[in-house]
């Protein structure tokens, strides 16, 4: 037969610790029931009576089994630079990640603080290593025999083209120019074209509270803006 | 993202000890309980031990209790797992994961680090 | 300690077929049961909580349903990508345990 169970609340036997989805109140010195995610403790709990729950309001959550007396704040609105990748409710935090074409420049435990946009490679300079979520485009001088002629940050440096009679000779940020005659061959014929990183997150990410709700989350600096590398254009 | 990496293991003999470490990123790491699973070479799971956020509670399968010790640095957002008077039968994949609602629901997982205890 | 008795070991079955497991607790555990899969070689992954709750991302031909001691996890149209182990796990109380998995593959 199984054990008998014990009903919160009740005093733990000497040395053991409350069950799952228990804590221990100092105060009345029991076991008592903690408030399910999207809840959180109205009323503590007593010799005589158990915990009482009530739902998170508008904006708040909890989402762990908690005694907490306050549901904590959903995050801020996302900024126009980013895209909501999960919504505020009773259960989950908002998280904001950054939109296609940005990178996150500052991060936070779940989600990101801080986009940037992905820096463009000018003319004369391709991308050596593309974009991701978390860092930025590198570009890299275009090397003799290729070329980029764009402004991009996902174009990378093609070779010239080879011509039987050269008009004009390629540069880092000009193809070849043929006279009349075409081409012998044509090692590039169009713009080759790096995929853009795409802003998408873990489909079981968990919330967090924001730094200013949860006195335990860890604070990052703010970081000043860096120059852009050699051959990147700012936009 | 949330993403766990555990080390640590390796061969070990017959009552030697090893300590396990797992690194937690993406998450709020000292918001939530963390806990020790392990798979025999060609077996299930096996629940080993828990830990709660802020450490102060600890839970063990017997098997292991006595002999492993659950701990966490939330400085350093890792989980730790003290191996002693190790077993041939301690033979196993170790996972840590983390527990997403402080409900013994294992939410993500690590991929794993092998013990081997053999002389 | 409550024990988790999954079954069948094993089973075999043909791309769309329905695919049922049972998990069963050796006491009343309410709806504190949690699904998971695991193919070779990786780590497991949640699939279902709380008996019958599908977790973020999880395709909607997995499900779960039960309470008390007596559980279900069904596949409604078995594909090739879940040739994998499952396993139960009851939440109800430490120590936390897993039924002995149930290893699905293709006929």
């Known amino acids: 037969l199984p054990a008998q169970v014990a009903f919160t609340p009740y005093a733990p036997e000497p040395g053991s610790t409350c069950r799952l989805r228990e804590y221990y109140d100092q105060t009345a010195q029991m076991c008592c029931s903690k408030c399910s995610p999207g809840q959180h403790a109205k009323v503590f709990c007593t010799k005589t009576s158990d915990t009482v729950c009530d739902s998170c309001e508008d904006s708040t959550y909890t989402q762990l089994w908690n005694w907490v007396p306050e549901c904590l704040s959903c995050g801020s609105r996302c900024s126009s630079d980013q895209v909501e990748t999960q919504a505020c409710t009773r259960e989950q935090n908002r998280i904001c990640t950054c939109r296609p074409g940005w990178y996150c420049a500052l991060s936070k435990q779940e989600g990101c603080r801080l986009c940037a946009p992905l820096r463009k490679c000018r003319p004369g300079f391709g991308v050596a290593r593309p974009g991701t979520e978390t860092s930025d485009v590198v570009c890299k001088p275009c090397a003799p025999g290729t070329f980029s002629n764009t402004t991009s940050s996902t174009d990378i440096c093609r070779p010239h083209q080879i011509c039987n009679v050269v008009a004009i000779p390629g540069n880092a940020s000009m193809d070849a120019v043929c006279t009349s005659t075409s081409p012998t061959r044509s090692m590039a014929p169009g713009a080759v074209h790096l995929p853009q990183p795409v802003s998408t997150r873990s489909q079981h990410t968990q919330p967090t509270p924001e730094p200013s709700t949860a006195p335990s989350t860890s604070f990052l600096l703010p970081m000043g803006p860096s120059p852009p590398a050699e051959g990147s254009t700012g936009d | 993202q949330v993403q766990l990496l555990e080390s640590g293991g390796g061969l070990v003999q017959p009552g030697g000890s090893l300590r396990l470490s797992c690194a937690a990123s993406?998450?709020?790491?000292?918001?939530?309980?963390m806990t020790w699973v392990r798979q025999a070479p060609g077996k299930g799971l096996e629940w080993v031990s828990a830990?709660?956020?802020?450490?102060?509670?600890?839970f063990y399968a017997d098997s292991v209790k006595g002999r492993f010790t659950i701990s966490r640095d939330n400085s350093k957002n890792t989980l730790y797992l003290q191996m002693n008077s190790l077993r041939a039968e301690d033979t196993a994949v170790y996972y840590c994961a983390r527990d997403g609602t402080y409900a013994a629901r294992f939410d993500y997982w690590g991929q794993g680090t092998l013990v081997t205890v053999s002389s | 300690d409550i024990q988790m008795t999954q079954s069948p070991s094993s089973l075999s079955a043909s791309v769309g077929d329905r695919v049922t497991i049972t998990c069963q607790a050796s006491?009343?555990?309410?709806?504190?049961l949690n699904w998971y899969q695991q193919k070779p070689g990786k780590a497991p992954k949640l699939l279902i909580y709380?008996?019958?709750t599908l977790e973020t991302g999880v395709p909607s031909r997995f499900s779960g349903s039960g309470s008390g001691t007596d559980f279900t996890f069904t596949i409604s149209s078995l594909q090739p990508e879940d040739i994998a182990t499952y396993y139960c796990?009851?939440?109800?109380?430490?120590?936390?345990?897993f039924g002995q998995g149930t290893k699905v593959e293709i006929k």
């Open positions: 796990q009851q939440s109800d109380s430490f120590p936390i345990t």
């Open positions: 709380d008996a019958s």
């Open positions: 993406g998450f709020t790491f000292n918001t939530y309980a």
């Open positions: 006491q009343d555990i309410s709806n504190y």
């Open positions: 830990i709660s956020d802020s450490g102060g509670d600890t």
